[in-house]
């Protein structure tokens, strides 16, 4: 389960993004040889600082559809 306001990195970050973004996917490509400029931001933000749900959602690939 997602735990708010803590650092997230490594596989745990990937798993959490998959949970938060669901079918939308998220902004980075693997393997590491293709680390993108955008993905650097989430590493800087989440691996070393408190990383909350709102921030994680900004890295989801497309906006969630409103009902």
């Amino acid at each position: 389960a997602y735990r708010p306001s803590e650092t997230l990195c490594g596989g745990e970050l990937v798993d959490t993004l998959q949970f938060v973004c669901g079918d939308r996917g998220f902004y980075f490509s693997r393997p590491a040889s293709r680390v993108s400029r955008r993905s650097r931001g989430i590493v800087e933000e989440c691996c070393f600082r408190s990383c909350d749900l709102a921030l994680l959602e900004t890295y989801c690939a497309t906006p969630a559809k409103s009902e």
């Epitope: 490594g10 596989g11 745990e12 693997r30 680390v35 993905s39 590493v43 800087e44 070393f48």
Partner: antibody, heavy 119, light 108 residues
Framework: EVQLLESGGGLVQPGGSLRLSCAAS????????MTWVRQAPGKGLEWVSS????????VYADSVKGRFTISRDNSKNTLYLQMNSLRAEDTAVYYC????????????WGQGTMVTVSS | DIQMTQSPSSLSASVGDRVTITCRAS??????LNWYQQKPGKAPKLLIY???KLEDGVPSRFSGSGTGTDFTLTIRSLQPEDFASYFC??????????FGPGTKVEIK
């Protein structure tokens, strides 16, 4: 081709200082967390410290906290480890490695640089 | 912190033997488990990543399995060049990556 080349090791007395460097090439250095790992003679691998892609954030193992300082110069593609108040138990081969932050392995390592702390 | 344990700490085997090394994590790390080989005086070399994926150039006699907390590295038919130390590493939680204590494979 990705390359990591450590330097700066040597023999130092207890309480002394050393500065290690790791020159990186063949990849976008500024995109990666960079990490120092060490290995004492005949022992296993121990994570020492990591630094964020921009260099703005750092983390340390408890064993080196307050004595070691990690830094980087993205314009020179170089990682550093300033080691102060060295102890005999810091004797080890020091390796740098890159970390994507996305659960990838340490796919490239340097050859290591030996630090010996002895009187 | 996630703790990693390995067994055995050392083993003696002969060329052609099947060798199995196990690694256990103190909590689930899904499949974020990597295996390295290290020879004396050399840097570690990546063998297997994501628990079971063979790194490019690594012989197919090496294989990995497991998920969650329990993982295995198998060398199907030990070759002379395989006598070395082997380390597991979790990449589920980073920075602060942790390694297993290692397994030394020696000639019987």
């Amino acid at each position: 081709e990705v390359q990591l080349l450590e330097s700066g090791g040597g023999l130092v007395q207890p309480g002394g200082s050393l500065r290690l460097s790791c020159a990186a090439s063949g990849f976008t250095f500024s995109a990666y967390i960079m990490t120092w790992v060490r290995q004492a003679p005949g022992k296993g691998l121990e994570w020492v410290s990591s630094i964020s892609p921009s260099g703005g954030y750092t983390v340390y193992a408890d064993s080196v906290k307050g004595r070691f300082t990690i830094s980087r110069d993205n314009s020179k593609n170089t990682l550093y480890l300033q080691m102060n108040s060295l102890r005999a138990e810091d004797t080890a081969v020091y390796y740098c490695a890159r970390d994507s932050g996305f659960g990838d392995p340490f796919d490239y390592w340097g050859q290591g640089t030996m630090v010996t702390v002895s009187s | 912190d996630i703790q990693m344990t390995q067994s055995p700490s050392s083993l003696s085997a002969s060329v052609g033997d099947r060798v199995t090394i196990t690694c256990r994590a103190s909590q689930s790390i899904r499949n974020y488990l990597n295996w390295y080989q290290q020879k004396p005086g050399k840097a570690p070399k990546l063998l297997i990543y994501a628990a079971s994926k063979l790194e490019d150039g690594v012989p197919s006699r090496f294989s990995g399995s497991g998920t969650g907390t329990d993982f295995t590295l198998t060398i199907r038919s030990l070759q002379p060049e395989d006598f070395a130390s082997y380390f597991c590493q979790q990449s589920y939680s980073s920075p602060g990556i942790t390694f297993g204590p290692g397994t030394k494979v020696e000639i019987k």
